[in-house]
């Protein structure tokens, strides 16, 4: 058993049929010595008396808010949550496996630049009685500070018969050094509580590996005289790190016909313009990637050829 | 050339070669990010590699003030990785095919380090740890980890030379 926060405790249980469970001793936070009784949740049934209460925690029915009273007055509470371990593996019932980039990916994170700011998100099908708490650091043995905000519900989608809820959180490294080569990864820890079930999820990454620039901005076409060719130009996204002579991007320009089956013409360039042939009913799209490190491409910015 | 005395390197040449290094480092192992490297008996094997850290003056301001600190750090790293790529970790079994990009990568690391430091001038170099894996799979694991950290190192070096070529070239 360990303390998650004041008056909230997590009991770690090996979860299998007829498991013996864990013996837990609760102590009433009071100077009083006698006349103390204990109840669980809203029940008025007295579970025991005295300053301490010993219970055998085996299942969710044994978890909940234990309250010690004296003469009708509440003295203190202890909330017991359960953390299940099945076949040596901690349960992951609350969050959905996003399976990208590999199986058992529950948290996904992205950064728009090298400033030390990043966003993580996760999915669940649970809509109520759900709380999240996020902590982060750079490195684990001698951790350096990363400040995370509160997790918020950022999207709801319908997937088949059930709803899926996306939560996200923004974090900022306290003393970020954008130009340095990271040697210690960022660690992100999410505590999830659904009713009386506790789970924790972690992710470890370098900012450089989660970089995904915003799409190029101000995408424009300029027809070239007496030619089917056009000059496409664009600019670095506002959110990208500066100076651009140091934090450079590379770009992919694509000409795509109306039909998905039509052959795509692609050009790669380090410049912020390119000359392409504009076909009727086609569109021109441009996306960006860090020039020197193969992290994710941005989403496409597009304009119609006409 | 970045001689220890402090004259400027051939920024544009360094920029071109460092960008080529980035391409080679990724072609040597593009899949590396999607491999599960959490093997049993896998200690932190690449913590001894030289990293370009915050105080090394490789940021735009630091380069403007005095690029020598940063260039020396990059040179140290290039020599270090060049030795690693020429060691038993990469020459031992399982052997890399003759057309593997690692060969070109090895040569390019040497080429860039010579651009930065012509013969006759000596910056101190970092001691290379004696990583001699007893098992072929450990050698493979080390290769992946070394290439992964090399990708990060050459990315910073390439940014330095690109910025230098754009803003510090005479």
């Amino acid at each position: 058993i360990w303390e998650l926060k004041k008056d909230v405790y997590v009991v770690e249980l090996d979860w299998y049929p007829d498991a013996p469970g864990e013996m837990v001793v609760l102590t009433c936070d009071t100077p009083e010595e006698d006349g103390i009784t204990w109840t669980l949740d809203q029940s008025s049934e007295v579970l025991g008396s005295g300053k301490t209460l010993t219970i055998q925690v085996k299942e969710f029915g044994d978890a909940g808010q234990y309250t010690c009273h004296k003469g009708g007055e509440v003295l203190s509470h202890s909330l017991l949550l359960l953390h299940k371990k099945e076949d040596g593996i901690w349960s992951t019932d609350i969050l959905k496996d996003q399976k990208e980039p590999k199986n058992k990916t529950f948290l996904r994170c992205e950064a728009k630049n090298y400033s030390g700011r990043f966003t993580c998100w996760w999915l669940t099908t649970i809509s109520t009685d759900l709380t999240f708490s996020v902590k982060s650091s750079r490195g684990s043995s001698d951790p350096q500070g990363v400040t995370c905000g509160a997790a918020t519900l950022s999207a709801e989608r319908v997937r088949g018969d059930n709803k899926e809820y996306e939560y996200s959180v923004e974090c900022q490294e306290d003393s970020a050094c954008p130009a340095a080569e990271e040697s210690l990864p960022i660690e992100v820890m999410v505590d999830a509580v659904h009713k009386l079930k506790y789970e924790n999820y972690t992710s470890s990454f370098f900012i450089r590996d989660i970089i995904k620039p915003d799409p190029p901005k101000n995408l424009q076409l300029k027809p070239l005289k007496n030619s089917r060719q056009v000059e496409v130009s664009w600019e670095y996204p506002d959110t990208w790190s500066t100076p651009h002579s140091y934090f450079s991007l590379t770009f992919c320009v694509q000409v795509q016909g109306k039909s998905k089956r039509e052959k795509k013409d692609r050009v790669f360039t380090d410049k912020t313009s390119a000359t392409v042939i504009c076909r009727k009913n086609a569109s021109i799209s441009v996306r960006a990637q860090d020039r020197y490190y193969s992290s994710s491409w941005s989403e496409w910015a597009s304009v119609p050829c006409s | 050339r970045a001689v220890p005395g402090g004259s400027s390197p051939a920024w544009t040449q360094c920029q071109q070669l460092s960008q080529k290094l980035c391409t080679l480092a990724w072609s040597a192992h593009p899949l590396v990010g999607h491999m599960d490297l959490r093997e049993e008996g896998d200690e932190e094997t690449t913590n001894d590699v030289p990293h370009i850290q915050c105080g090394d003056g490789c940021d735009p301001q630091g380069l403007r003030d005095n690029s020598q600190f940063c260039l020396q750090r990059i040179h140290q790293g290039l020599i270090f990785y060049e030795k690693l790529l020429g060691s038993d970790i990469f020459t031992g079994e399982p052997s890399l095919l003759p057309d593997s990009p690692v060969g070109q990568l090895h040569a390019s690391l040497l080429g860039l380090s010579q651009l930065l430091q012509p013969e006759g001038h000596h910056w101190e170099t970092q001691q290379i740890p004696s990583l001699s894996p007893s098992q072929p799979w450990q050698r493979l694991l080390l290769r992946f980890k070394i290439l992964r950290s090399l990708q990060a190192f050459v990315a910073v070096a390439a940014r330095v030379f690109a910025h230098g070529a754009a803003t510090l070239s005479p």
């Epitope: - | 093997e39 020459t91 098992q135 799979w137 493979l140 992946f144």
Partner: antibody, heavy 126, light 111 residues
Framework: QVQLVQSGAEVKKPGSSVKVSCKAS????????ITWVRQAPGQGLEWMGE????????YYNEKFKGRVTITADKSTSTAYMELSSLRSEDTAVYYC???????????????????WGQGTLVTVSS | DIVMTQSPDSLAVSLGERATINCKAS???????????LHWYQQKPGQPPKLIYN??KPESGVPDRFSGSGSGTDFTLTISSLQAEDVAVYYC?????????FGGGTKVEIK
């Protein structure tokens, strides 16, 4: 075509040594390793060790506690396996096999004993 | 050393029937969670062994009635429809760790 031709059968006294040769042809000798595997009469296969001429690396089965020495002569494309302090339980057919052990971007681990010698019977008897 | 345990020791199967050979390693013989360092060899009487499965891939020229599967510590070689020419002893070999080790062999015969 690729061929591995081993030296002829040997009868040895306990405590003595035997040196079996394996001459390779039909491929670039230094580009592959040579593995030695033995098989006692009516028994299974046992890996003894292997040598890679290109890297100069040799790997041994510690079970033989320094009794086995595997070498290669690039100039004659011949591999050798010497086993010393022979005992009766070393009576076996000794095979050499070409070992291809490579790593590529797409196949990080490819190991094949793809061509084998005809085997050399070594009998240890007093 | 990694101990390779093959089962069964011998197997008698009717022509055209399925033969299944198991190989269990005392330690994981996959690398990076997916690549297999487990190989299958076939040895016919009086001949040296012949590689038939390399990791998860059949060698060229091996009939497609042979299939290899498994990961971690448990591996299987299946002959979907046994032919007379498949009578042999089959060995698994791990080359994740030196010393490389063979299984004890499984003798496949016709019932």
């Amino acid at each position: 075509q690729v061929q591995l031709v081993q030296s002829g059968a040997e009868v040895k006294k306990p405590g003595s040594s035997v040196k079996v040769s394996c001459k390779a042809s039909g491929y670039t000798f230094a580009s592959y390793g040579i593995t030695w595997v033995r098989q006692a009469p009516g028994q299974g296969l046992e890996w003894m060790g292997e040598n890679y001429p290109r890297s100069g690396n040799t790997y041994y089965n510690e079970k033989f506690k320094g009794r086995v020495t595997i070498t290669a002569d690039k100039s004659t494309s011949t591999a050798y396996m010497e086993l010393s302090s022979l005992r009766s339980e070393d009576t076996a057919v000794y095979y050499c096999a070409r070992a291809e052990f490579i790593s590529t971007v797409v196949a990080p681990y490819y190991y094949a004993l793809d061509y084998w010698g005809q085997g050399t019977l070594v009998t240890v008897s007093s | 050393d990694i101990v390779m345990t093959q089962s069964p020791d011998s197997l008698a199967v009717s022509l055209g029937e399925r033969a299944t050979i198991n190989c269990k390693a005392s330690k994981k013989v996959t690398i990076f969670g997916s690549t297999s360092a487990l190989h299958w060899y076939q040895q016919k009487p009086g001949q040296p062994p012949k590689l038939i499965y390399n990791g998860a891939k059949p060698e060229s020229g091996v009939p497609d009635r042979f299939s290899g599967s498994g990961s971690g510590t448990d591996f299987t070689l299946t002959i979907s429809s046994l032919q007379a020419e498949d009578v042999a002893v089959y060995y698994c070999l791990q080359n994740k760790e030196v010393p490389y080790t063979f299984g004890g062999g499984t003798k496949v015969e016709i019932k």
